[in-house]
């Protein structure tokens, strides 16, 4: 028969014959022959291959370097890489999460719209009228101004986006 020029899925062409690729988690040791199938062996400890392949070496699992603020989110297997995330209070600088930076704090006048996660930074928003934030924080939202009326008080000093209103007693002297 004519030697093949193309092979089925999960096969590769070598020496005019189709050999099976190695399954995820295994590496190629020897191509198939007319007598035996492809020889594959498992990846070692701390190694992986995540596709059907003909790689002669497995890839090393990613190292989550604590010196860069990283920790293991999901331990790697022979078929998957380790997934790193950042320590509490830090987030990844890229999708690959190769290093971490401290979560951003929202300055006075700004509140936290979305709290940071291991992979995304804090999202701040300006405090709208009627709300304020007087601290620099990675967690605090804008707080509503105090309602003097509900306390039977009057506004003595108007609030800003950074300060609360100041309430005082009602002036009882009437003209």
């Amino acid at each position: 028969p004519e030697p093949p020029t193309a092979c089925r899925e999960k096969q590769y062409l070598i020496n005019s014959q189709c050999c099976s690729l190695c399954q995820p988690g295994q590496k190629l040791v020897s191509d198939c022959t007319e007598f035996t199938e492809t020889e594959c062996l498992p990846c070692g400890e701390s190694e992986f291959l995540d596709t059907w392949n003909r790689e002669t070496h497995c890839h090393q699992h990613k190292y989550c370097d604590p010196n860069l603020g990283l920790r293991v989110q999901q331990k790697g297997t022979s078929e998957t890489d380790t997934i790193c995330t950042c320590e509490e209070g830090w987030h990844c600088t890229s999708e690959a999460c190769e290093s971490c930076v401290l979560h951003r704090s929202c300055s006075p006048g700004f509140g936290v719209k979305q709290i940071a996660t291991g992979v995304s930074d804090t999202i701040c928003e300006p405090c709208p009228v009627g709300f304020f934030s007087n601290v620099s924080s990675a967690f605090e939202k804008c707080h509503p101004w105090t309602s003097c009326e509900t306390k039977d008080l009057v506004v003595q000093q108007a609030g800003t986006n950074k300060t609360d209103v100041v309430c005082g007693p009602q002036d009882r002297l009437r003209a």
């Epitope: 020897s30 191509d31 035996t36 498992p42 070692g44 070496h57």
Partner: antibody, heavy 115, light 110 residues
């Protein structure tokens, strides 16, 4: 069909080294590992280690670590096994074979260590 | 790692079946489906007769079969023939790019 042809018999003095060659033909040289196995007279098979010709990476059995070196020459499709600090008990037939599975074998090389 | 354990000898009459065992540990035979069996006639290089625990290379008759249970692999030669008289060795992948052989079994056809 892969064929493995080994170098000829050797007689060595204790303390010296021996280098056995294994020339591959047929198939793609870089696409299979080569294991080395020895067999002392009247004894069983003993795996010594392997070399991956595609990258030249090696793995040696603990017993031979520090005494064995496996290399390859891709230009001649040949792998070599060198054993140093030879002793009389290293007298054996040394075989090369394809892969860990060892589905094809060389004809063997008799190494005699004697003073 | 230490050698796999095989009985030193086994025997059977022509036409009978003989089973040879190969006992390892949970780090080699028990851990991987990468057990091979070899036949070696005197003065010859070994010949692969079983790989990946139970597969036969093409050209090897189906009188040779193999299996594994736990840390023990077995080779069965059925319909024994005079030419089956030889030494038989098992080997197993032992992880970390290491391989270990059994001590060998001398099969005699009575």
């Amino acid at each position: 069909q892969v064929q493995l042809v080994q170098s000829g018999a050797e007689v060595k003095k204790p303390g010296s080294s021996v280098k056995v060659s294994c020339k591959a033909s047929g198939g793609t040289f870089s696409s299979y590992a080569i294991s080395w196995v020895r067999q002392a007279p009247g004894q069983g098979l003993e795996w010594m280690g392997m070399i991956n010709p595609s990258g030249g990476t090696t793995s040696y059995a603990q017993k031979f670590q520090g005494r064995v070196t496996m290399t390859r020459d891709t230009s001649t499709s040949t792998v070599y096994m060198e054993l140093s600090s030879l002793r009389p008990e290293d007298t054996a037939v040394y075989y090369c074979a394809r892969g860990f599975r060892m589905d094809q074998w060389g004809q063997g090389t008799l190494v005699t260590v004697s003073s | 790692q230490s050698a796999l354990t095989q009985p030193p000898s086994a025997s059977g009459s022509p036409g009978q079946s003989v089973t040879i065992s190969c006992t390892g540990t949970s780090s080699d035979v028990g851990a991987y489906n990468f057990v091979s069996w070899y036949q070696q006639h005197p003065g010859n290089a070994p010949k692969l007769i079983i790989y990946d625990t139970r597969k036969r290379p093409s050209g090897i008759p189906d009188r040779f079969s193999a299996s594994k249970s736990g840390n023990t692999a077995s080779l069965t030669v059925s319909g024994l023939q005079a030419d089956d008289e030889a030494d038989y060795y098992c080997s197993s992948y032992a992880g970390n790019n290491n391989l270990v052989f059994g001590g060998g079994t001398k099969l005699t056809v009575l």
